[in-house]
Interface confidence: low
């Protein structure tokens, strides 16, 4: 049996994946649940099995096709339903008319690499993954650098208000280990949110030259 309120949130990665999280206050006991996607004007539909991520929330990924295929566009509507099994029947627990390009969350940037490192600066590049060609250059990035003795949460955010897949970090300390992360967000979409942070890139600045005053 299901009681209590539920929250059903989904994001489109702009290509061929819709990720959903369903939270339910009441208890679900040994109940199988799934998300069903029914696009309004396309021949296909898709289902994924909700798997527990915490005591009261479940998640799944609707794989719509090959990772770089453009499966939905700005005028698509996808009816998303949470269905839970009750005996031999399926009960609709939540429903939403999902507008993919109003609910975007891109994949985390990939292929981070140090292009050039010096004593006080480091040039880093990255790539975006599975991002729709519809965005053209309408993307922004946030980056952060982890310094020794600090946490990621304490790291100041650097904002790049354009599609710029590199950054030059300045005023770094020589011969010091750092980590760097970046995330991306399209400018489009009322409920669009930041991608997950990229995998951290570790790098070390060069030591200061011997015999020089610092």
């Amino acid at each position: 049996a299901v009681n209590g309120t539920s929250q059903f949130t989904c994001f489109y990665n702009s290509r061929a994946n819709i990720s959903c999280v369903w939270s339910q206050d009441g208890a679900l006991q040994d109940t199988s649940c799934q998300v069903h996607a029914w696009p309004d004007r396309r021949r296909w539909n898709q289902t994924c099995e909700l798997l527990p991520v915490s005591q009261a929330s479940w998640a799944c990924n609707l794989i719509l096709g090959a990772p770089d295929s453009q499966k939905l566009t700005t005028v698509d509507i996808v009816t998303l339903r949470v269905l839970c099994r009750e005996g031999v029947r399926w009960r609709v627990m939540a429903i939403q008319d999902f507008k993919p390009f109003e609910n975007l969350r891109l994949m985390a940037p990939i292929s981070l690499q140090v292009v050039h490192v010096e004593t006080h600066r480091c040039n880093i590049s990255w790539e975006i993954s599975q991002a729709s060609h519809y965005f053209e250059r309408h993307l922004e990035f946030e980056a952060r650098t982890l310094s020794p003795g600090h946490t990621w949460e304490e790291a100041p955010l650097l904002t790049l208000k354009q599609k710029q897949e590199w950054i030059c970090l300045e005023t770094l300390t020589p011969d010091t280990q750092y980590e760097f992360q970046v995330r991306v967000k399209p400018l489009q979409g009322e409920f669009t949110t930041w991608s997950p942070w990229s995998q951290p890139l570790a790098f070390r600045t060069k030591p200061a030259a011997l015999g020089k005053d610092t």
Epitope: W38, R42, R43, I77, Q96, D97
Partner: antibody, heavy 119, light 106 residues
Framework: EVQLLESGGGLVQPGGSLRLSCAAS????????VHWIRQAPGKGLEWLGV???????DYNAAFISRLTISKDNSKNTVYFQMNSLRAEDTAVYYC?????????????WGQGTLVTVSS | DIQMTQSPSSLSASVGDRVTITCQAS?????MYWYQQRPGKAPRLLIY???NLASGVPSRFSGSGSGTSYTFTISSLQPEDIATYYC?????????FGQGTKVEIK
């Protein structure tokens, strides 16, 4: 067979309201969106809005302040209401549905219902 | 809104003639549709997704184009093709139609 049947047209006073019905058969309005399109006498086609399978709507911004599209899933019927009517709203009003495949346009149309706004 | 400009607004051609109608969009669109409307009737879908023939539509009808420029062709005009033809974009809301091209037989 997919069919759409509009009703509710007729003579309406300026400033009055209009409520049209679109009865769907051969498919469920819980699975497909239903659009409304109109055509003034001797003029072209104008898209007004749509109600999607889950109940959400998209409207032409030019009509958003006076247009409401709703539906009754149990009756498999979509409703179109427009307020503050004026003479230029005189038109044949159609409901339409897209086909099943990718972007296959308005494959199914009702026969249309004529609305005349006049005193 | 994306404006759709059809040309010509009307034309007269002989049976068997090749007839071409163009539709120019005010900005780039991804998908173009063409409809036929006979007097007193609802529109009928002829071409979807720029170049695909709708079910039951004769092969003398065809469509092509991309970006802002699209073309609709009747390869051999038949008496039953007397109608008004409309283009329509389905890339951005509001969905918009061309003003129509009236085709008559000489």
């Amino acid at each position: 067979e997919v069919q759409l049947l509009e009703s509710g047209g007729g003579l309406v006073q300026p400033g009055g309201s209009l409520r049209l019905s679109c009865a769907a058969s051969g498919f469920s309005v819980t699975s497909y969106g239903v659009h409304w399109i109109r055509q003034a006498p001797g003029k072209g086609l104008e898209w007004l809005g749509v109600i999607w399978s889950g109940g959400s709507t998209d409207y032409n911004a030019a009509f958003i302040s006076r247009l409401t599209i709703s539906k009754d899933n149990s009756k498999n019927t979509v409703y179109f209401q427009m307020n503050s009517l004026r003479a230029e709203d005189t038109a044949v009003y159609y409901c339409a549905r897209a086909g099943d495949a990718n972007y296959d346009g308005f494959a199914y149309w009702g026969q249309g219902t004529l609305v005349t706004v006049s005193s | 809104d994306i404006q759709m400009t059809q040309s010509p607004s009307s034309l007269s051609a002989s049976v068997g003639d090749r007839v071409t109608i163009t539709c120019q969009a005010s900005s780039s669109v991804s998908f173009m549709y063409w409809y036929q409307q006979r007097p007193g009737k609802a529109p009928r879908l002829l071409i979807y997704d720029t170049s695909n023939l709708a079910s039951g539509v004769p092969s003398r009808f065809s469509g092509s184009g991309s970006g802002t420029s699209y073309t609709f062709t009747i390869s051999s005009l038949q008496p039953e093709d007397i109608a008004t033809y409309y283009c329509q974009q389905w890339s951005t809301y509001p969905l918009t139609f061309g003003q129509g091209t009236k085709v008559e037989i000489k």
